[in-house]
C-alpha cells in the first residue's frame, strides 16, 4: 500500500459513536487506529479536555511479524453509570511523529424522562403586577412539551398547547403555587413547586401635609394588597447628609434611620421631635400578612425655620459720657434657623422706646445726648431668623462708666435706623 501521504492522513479508522440513554446506563466508546510502527498511546478527550482518570483500555494487534509493520490499536472508554457529568463531546487524541491527530467526535447524552435545566423559583410579587416564570427541560428524546400548573390546576388543555419556556402571569391577588410538567416520549417529569407570595404594592404619592419647625405631617396612598388587608405601614426618616446624599431609590440608607410604625387607616403620620430648618429624606412601605411592600423612593423634605428659642446672653451695657456701649453673645438656645441678626430696644424711664435692627453685629455704640437727667435707661436684645424674633432678653440697665457722671439727654441716639418691624415692649 502506498504510504507517501500517511503522515498527513489521520491514522483513525474508527471514531467514538454516540451514546444516548437514561441515567445509570453503561456504555462503551471506541477509537480504532491503524498505524505503521510503534503504536501510540491513545488519550481520551471530553469537550476538548484530556480525561486524566478515564476508565479506558487499549488493545494493540500487530498485523505482521516485523516491528515496522502495521498495528491495529483499539481504545475503549467505558462509561459505567451514565450521569449528567458524562455528557459531552468525546474524541481520541494520539501523538504520531511530530503531529497530533484527533478523531472525529462522538457524543454522550442522556435520554429518558425530561431533565429540567430551569425550574420556577420562589419569589415575591406585588399584587396585581405582571411577572414571568421560567421553566426549561430537555430530552432526549425531543420534543419536550411543557404544561404549567397554577395551584395544581393545568393552565392549558394539553402539554405544548399553552405557554412553554416562559409563563407570563398578568397579576395575582393571592399567594399561589406554580409548577411545570415536562412531557416527552418517555414520560413526564414534574418540576419543583414555586411559591409566589403576593405582597402589597409600593405606596404611592408620599407627600407632606403640613410642616412645623420640629414636626412634619406626611400622607401617602396605599397600593393594592390583593386579598390581604394592610396591617400597618412603616415610615423611615433620615437626616439628609450632604456628604452622603441619599439617592432616589437607593436600596438602603447609609446610616440607621428613624423608623416609625403607623396604624392604617389613615395613611398619615405625624413625625415629631425633629430639628428645625433641617433637610430629611423619608420613605414608606406597607405590610400585609404576606409581608412588606417595597419602599417608596426617598422623598426629600425639610422642616421650616423657627424663631430662636432663647435670647442673646451675656449682655453688657455701659455708658461713658455721651456714648453707650452695648455688646452680647449669640443665644445658647437653638436658633431653629439661620440667624439673620439682632434687634435692640432701649428706653428711659420717661422716654419712648427706641427699636434698632443691629444686623449680625454683636455690639453697638449708641451716641447719647442729654444732661444726664434720663434715668433708668435699660437695653433689651433679641435674635431673629426668617421666622421671626426670638424672646427678648431681660432689660439690662445702662451702667455709668464713671460713677456720678451724667449728661443731659437731648437726643437719645445720634443715628438710628428705622425699625423694620414694630415691636411691643415686653
Amino acid at each position: 500500500a502506498p504510504r507517501g501521504t500517511q503522515a498527513e492522513e489521520s491514522p483513525f479508522v474508527g471514531n467514538p459513536g454516540n451514546i444516548t440513554g437514561a441515567r445509570g446506563l453503561t456504555g462503551t466508546l471506541r477509537c480504532q487506529l491503524q498505524v505503521q510502527g510503534e503504536p501510540p498511546e491513545v488519550h481520551w478527550l471530553r469537550d476538548g479536555q484530556i480525561l486524566e482518570l478515564a476508565d479506558s483500555t487499549q488493545t494493540q494487534v500487530p498485523l505482521g511479524e516485523d516491528e515496522q509493520d502495521d498495528w491495529i490499536v483499539v481504545s475503549q472508554l467505558r462509561i459505567a453509570s451514565l450521569q449528567l457529568s458524562d455528557a459531552g463531546q468525546y474524541q481520541c487524541l494520539v501523538f504520531l511523529g511530530h503531529q497530533n491527530f484527533v478523531s472525529q467526535p462522538g457524543y454522550v447524552g442522556l435520554e429518558g424522562l425530561p431533565y429540567f435545566l430551569e425550574e420556577p423559583e420562589d419569589r415575591t410579587v406585588a399584587a396585581n403586577t405582571p411577572f414571568n416564570l421560567s421553566c426549561q427541560a430537555q430530552g432526549p428524546p425531543e420534543p419536550v412539551d411543557l404544561l404549567w400548573l397554577q395551584d395544581a390546576v393545568p393552565l392549558a388543555t394539553a402539554p405544548g398547547h399553552g405557554p412553554q419556556r416562559n409563563l407570563h402571569v398578568p397579576g395575582l391577588n393571592k399567594t399561589s403555587s406554580f409548577s411545570c410538567e415536562a412531557h416527552n416520549a418517555k414520560g413526564v417529569t414534574t418540576s419543583r413547586t414555586a411559591t409566589i407570595t403576593v405582597l402589597p404594592q409600593q405606596p404611592r404619592n408620599l407627600h407632606l401635609v403640613s410642616r412645623q419647625p420640629t414636626e412634619l405631617e406626611v400622607a401617602w396612598t396605599p397600593g393594592l394588597s390583593g386579598i390581604y388587608p394592610l396591617t400597618h405601614c412603616t415610615l423611615q426618616a433620615m437626616l439628609s447628609d450632604n456628604e452622603v446624599g441619599i439617592q432616589a431609590g437607593e436600596p438602603d440608607p447609609p446610616e440607621e434611620p428613624l423608623t416609625l410604625q403607623a396604624s392604617v387607616p389613615p395613611h398619615q403620620l405625624r413625625l415629631g421631635s425633629l430639628h428645625p430648618h433641617t433637610p430629611y429624606h423619608i420613605r414608606v412601605a406597607c405590610t400585609s400578612s404576606q409581608g412588606p411592600s417595597s419602599w417608596t423612593h426617598w422623598l426629600p423634605v425639610e422642616t421650616p425655620e423657627g424663631v430662636p428659642l432663647g435670647p442673646p446672653e451675656n449682655i453688657s451695657a455701659t455708658r461713658n459720657g455721651s456714648q453707650a456701649f452695648v455688646h452680647w453673645q449669640e443665644p445658647p438656645a437653638p436658633l431653629q434657623g439661620t440667624l439673620l441678626g439682632y434687634r435692640l430696644a432701649y428706653q428711659g424711664q420717661d422716654t419712648p422706646e427706641v427699636l434698632m435692627d443691629i444686623g449680625l453685629r454683636q455690639e453697638v455704640t449708641l451716641e447719647l445726648q442729654g444732661d444726664g437727667s434720663v434715668s433708668n435707661l435699660t437695653v433689651c436684645v433679641a435674635a431673629y431668623t426668617a421666622a421671626g424674633d426670638g424672646p427678648w432678653s431681660l432689660p439690662v440697665p445702662l451702667e455709668a462708666w464713671r460713677p456720678g457722671q451724667a449728661q443731659p439727654v437731648h437726643q437719645l441716639v445720634k443715628e438710628t435706623s428705622a425699625p423694620a418691624f414694630s415691636w411691643p415692649w415686653w
Epitope: A1, P2, R3, G4, T5, Q6, E8, E9, S10, V13, G14, N15, P16, G17, R30, Q32, Q34, T59, V61, L63, D70, I72, V74, Q76, Q104, G106
Partner: antibody, heavy 120, light 107 residues
Framework: EVKLVESGGGLVQPGGSLNLSCAAS????????MSWVRQTPEKRLEWVAF????????YYPDTVKGRFTFSRDNARNTLYLQMSSLNSEDTAMYFC?????????????WGQGTSVTVSS | DIVMTQSHKFMSTSVGDRVSITCKAS??????VAWYQQKPGQSPKLLIY???TRHTGVPDRFTGSGSGTDYTLTISSVQAEDLALYFC?????????FGAGTKLELK
C-alpha cells in the same frame, strides 16, 4: 438518501483488465472511507480494497495486491477500481460500500453491484 | 489473516421464534464484529457493528453480543421478512474477512 451506483462490469478474458466505477451521492463523500467487496457465485463475501477519505491510504488483500488499484476523485464523488491480470477467481459481483464513522472497516451502505465475469 | 467461522450454513425457524446465529473468530477481535443481512437479489445490509451496536433503522428485535472470539446475532421474534442470508465480518484489521454465511429459512 445515500446512494452508490457501480458500473463498468462485464465479461473479460483471463489476463485482461477492467475498470469499475462507483458514483456516490446523498452524503459528504470526502468524509468517508470506502471499500470494494465482491461476492462469488457461491455467495461468499470477499473484501477487495480499502481507501481512506482523502485517498492517501489504500489497503488490499494479498489475493489482489499488485493487480488492483483503488482510487477516488472527491471532486466528482467517484471511486475507481482498476483491475488487471484478471483470472477466473475474480469472477464475482463487485459492490462498493461506505465505511461507518465508528469503524471504517464495517460497511453501512452498499451499492447494488456490478457483475464481472472472467472467462475465455 | 483472521478467519471467521459460521458453523451453521442453514438454520430453520418459525415466525415468532427466537433464533441465535453464531460466529467464531480465529483470534480475539476485541468486539470488532459486524453482522449483515442479505436478501435474494439485494446487496448486504448492515445490522450490527462493534458486536452490539445496532445500525440506524434496524429493528430492536436484532441484538448482537459477544466478546473475545465468540459472537452471536439474536433475533428475538423472527418475522417473515427476516428470512435471509446472514454474514458476520471482523472489522478489526485488514484484510477484512467474512464468515461463509448462515441462511435462515422456515421449518
Amino acid at each position: 438518501e445515500v446512494k452508490l451506483v457501480e458500473s463498468g462490469g462485464g465479461l473479460v478474458q483471463p489476463g485482461g483488465s477492467l475498470n469499475l466505477s462507483c458514483a456516490a451521492s446523498g452524503f459528504t463523500f470526502s468524509s468517508y472511507s470506502m471499500s470494494w467487496v465482491r461476492q462469488t457465485p457461491e455467495k461468499r463475501l470477499e473484501w477487495v480494497a480499502f481507501i481512506s477519505n482523502g485517498g492517501g491510504r489504500t489497503y488490499y488483500p494479498d489475493t489482489v495486491k499488485g493487480r488492483f488499484t483503488f482510487s477516488r476523485d472527491n471532486a466528482r464523488n467517484t471511486l475507481y477500481l482498476q483491475m488487471s491480470s484478471l483470472n477466473s477467481e475474480d469472477t464475482a459481483m463487485y459492490f462498493c460500500a461506505r465505511g461507518t464513522t465508528e469503524s471504517y472497516y464495517a460497511m453501512d451502505y452498499w451499492g447494488q453491484g456490478t457483475s464481472v465475469t472472467v472467462s475465455s | 489473516d483472521i478467519v471467521m467461522t459460521q458453523s451453521h450454513k442453514f438454520m430453520s425457524t418459525s415466525v415468532g421464534d427466537r433464533v441465535s446465529i453464531t460466529c467464531k473468530a480465529s483470534q480475539d477481535v476485541i468486539t470488532a464484529v459486524a453482522w449483515y443481512q442479505q436478501k435474494p437479489g439485494q446487496s448486504p445490509k448492515l445490522l450490527i457493528y462493534w458486536a452490539s451496536t445496532r445500525h440506524t433503522g434496524v429493528p430492536d428485535r436484532f441484538t448482537g453480543s459477544g466478546s473475545g472470539t465468540d459472537y452471536t446475532l439474536t433475533i428475538s421474534s423472527v418475522q417473515a421478512e427476516d428470512l435471509a442470508l446472514y454474514f458476520c465480518q471482523q472489522h478489526l484489521s485488514t484484510p477484512l474477512t467474512f464468515g461463509a454465511g448462515t441462511k435462515l429459512e422456515l421449518k
